[in-house]
């Protein structure tokens, strides 16, 4: 079912509960909220990105099949190596690749820049989104998704890779950020917190949401993920915040109901195909966009992030299932799997709608401090 969301006219950050007051201190990230992964910005992009796959397990895409008409992906784990022993896919189906970067975790050692130098880059993700500072860009048209409503067969690979739960997507899911900006979906995964502790990666004016979904895409200009890593626009991620609502989300339940089967790190199951678009907000026209990086090693930059203004609602029970079912490395619960927000370092976040205009009665004058960088597109 499509979920209700915050008021259509108010930018993210006010929550869908309709609160008027600005976010309080409790909404700001704290030491406990964010994993202790320190990711100091580096002077400049560092080499080595191409060697490491990331964003949980980036699917490594194989060349397009003439018969299938689409890529075959795999999970590249940047954390695990794709086949324990080896494995690449649609290869977005590989969850264990890149042993070189398979040894990382949230919080503690090793520091991510040691795992992948790109993690010390200047244009990293996630970031804090401040709608008032976003540049309204009318050229940002509604996102176009094609082929996201999957039939039940073939089944899809749902895996606990030790850092997230990842659903590998089959060939044929096409997404366009705009004319000539076409992508193919590879995989989706989630980030979450723990009981009473939110776990989204991006924040809005310091507010962290309970969870966040990422749908990772490869530009049609590239046949493989490793070719696209670090290239501007080579990868694109659609991100949406998940928050608590009164009703069960039937689309998410198709995945959440299977988490017990993959509670153990490295375990996986097959789940029926489903409507992937139903996992996203219904409003594809209002979003924030910026260029950043993968949020896990190898932290490759050049990733186009599109963060929906509308949120997705899950029931309290569903959010609890998400944060309290899976296990990660070393007999520890898989929780708080989000990276701390990274400095913008001069980047301007664009908005497809006038997010800087506060629609509440208290706003006397619209505020829009940045102008659209893509005005001529």
């Amino acid at each position: 079912q499509r979920l209700p969301r915050m008021q259509e006219d108010s930018p993210l950050g006010g929550g869908s509960s309709g609160e008027d007051d600005p976010l309080g201190e409790e909404d700001l990230p704290s030491e406990e909220d964010s994993p202790r992964e320190e990711d100091p910005p580096g002077e400049e992009d560092l080499p080595g990105e191409e060697d490491l796959p990331g964003e949980e397990d980036l699917p490594e895409v194989k060349p397009k099949s003439e018969e299938e008409g689409s890529l075959k992906l795999e999970d590249l784990p940047t954390v695990e190596a794709p086949g324990d022993p080896q494995e690449p896919q649609n290869n977005a189906h590989r969850d264990k690749e890149g042993d070189d970067q398979s040894h990382w975790r949230y919080g503690g050692d090793p520091p991510w820049p040691r795992v992948s130098p790109a993690c010390a880059g200047r244009f990293q993700s996630p970031v804090d989104i401040r709608p008032q500072l976003a540049a309204f860009c009318p050229a940002l048209r509604p996102l176009e998704l094609l082929g996201f409503q999957l039939p039940p067969l073939p089944e899809l690979r749902l895996r606990n890779n030790g850092h997230s739960v990842q659903l590998t997507l089959p060939p044929g899911l096409e997404m366009a950020l705009g004319p000539g900006r076409e992508y193919r979906a590879l995989q989706l995964h989630l980030h979450w917190g723990a009981a009473g502790r939110p776990g989204s990666e991006h924040t809005v004016e310091g507010h962290r949401f309970p969870a966040e979904i990422h749908v990772v895409h490869l530009s049609t200009a590239f046949a493989r993920v490793d070719e696209a890593l670090g290239r501007p626009g080579g990868l694109a991620v659609l991100a949406a915040f998940l928050e608590e609502g009164p009703e069960e989300n039937s689309a998410y339940e198709q995945l959440l109901s299977r988490l017990e089967e993959i509670a153990e790190e490295g375990s996986e199951t097959q789940v029926p195909g489903l409507d992937i678009s139903a996992l996203l907000p219904s409003d594809f026209s209002r979003y924030f966009q910026y260029e950043g990086s993968l949020t896990t090693p190898p932290c490759a930059q050049g990733v186009i992030w599109t963060v929906f203004n509308q949120t997705v609602m899950l029931s309290a029970k569903q959010l609890h299932t998400l944060s309290d079912t899976l296990w990660g490395p070393g007999d520890s619960r898989l929780q708080l799997n989000f990276r701390a927000t990274q400095p913008l370092n001069g980047r301007v976040i664009e908005a497809s709608f006038p997010a800087g205009v506060d629609s509440s009665p208290r706003a006397a004058e619209p505020v829009q401090l940045n102008s659209c960088l893509a005005a001529g597109d």
Epitope: K62, S65, E68, G69, G83, H93, P170
Partner: antibody, heavy 116, light 109 residues
């Protein structure tokens, strides 16, 4: 542990019908697609067909289309293969297996012999 | 009908490495799965998604897939590895969906 057990095989004459069953246990049957695979004596594996988790979608190999029907009863954790108008070249061991894209668990098979 | 071509037989001495190939047009763009079948027994999944091993399968079994050939590699072959091996793909471009190779008989000398 996951267990699949086929039954219903036997010797039948060409043109007749037979219904195979597959009893599943050790997992939530209603969560998974199920597949039938057969193997003629001394030959390789041949995919027969499959059914989605809820029974809404079925696919068959060309040689059995219109003659074989796959169904399931999730309440009984059971999978079925209704075989009509049997031919001599349908003689094989029939396996039920869990999964669609790949088959992670298999039954021990049941032999169907079509002979006059 | 998509065709997956396997050599009918492969022979190897104990302790050596056996490589069983599965050829198909642009098979590297598909996920390949491998099954082992011993006489009188049901098939057993030994490799899935090109190179993943199910729990309980020895690390000696590995797989790769690119271009027009997928390969099942069995290192340090043991007598107990003697069996028939089948590759399999899902092919959504045809009505056949699940396609098996013809099988390869591995003989341990």
């Amino acid at each position: 542990q996951v267990t699949l057990k086929e039954s219903g095989g036997g010797v039948v004459q060409p043109g007749t019908s037979l219904r195979l069953s597959c009893a599943a246990s050790g997992f939530t049957f209603s969560n998974y697609a199920m597949t039938w695979v057969r193997q003629a004596p001394g030959k390789g594996l041949e995919w027969v067909g499959l059914i989605s988790y809820d029974g809404s979608v079925t696919h068959y190999t060309d040689s059995v289309k219109g003659r074989f029907t796959i169904s399931r009863d999730n309440a009984k954790n059971s999978l079925y293969l209704q075989m009509n108008t049997l031919r001599a070249d349908d003689t094989a061991v029939y396996y039920c297996a869990r999964g669609s894209g790949y088959q992670e668990h298999w039954g021990q098979g049941t032999l169907v012999t079509v002979s006059s | 009908l998509p065709v997956l071509t396997q050599p009918p037989s492969v022979s190897v001495a104990p302790g050596q490495t056996a490589r069983i190939t599965c050829g198909g047009n642009n098979i590297g763009s598909k996920s390949v799965h491998w099954y082992q079948q011993k006489p009188g027994q049901a098939p057993v999944l030994v490799i899935y998604y090109d190179s993943d091993r199910p729990s309980g399968i020895p690390e000696r079994f590995s797989g790769s897939n690119s271009g027009n050939t997928a390969t099942l590699t069995i290192s340090r072959v043991e007598a107990g590895d003697e069996a028939d091996y089948y590759c399999q793909v899902w092919d959504s471009s045809s009505d056949h969906h699940v396609v098996f190779g013809g099988g390869t008989k591995l003989t341990v000398l």
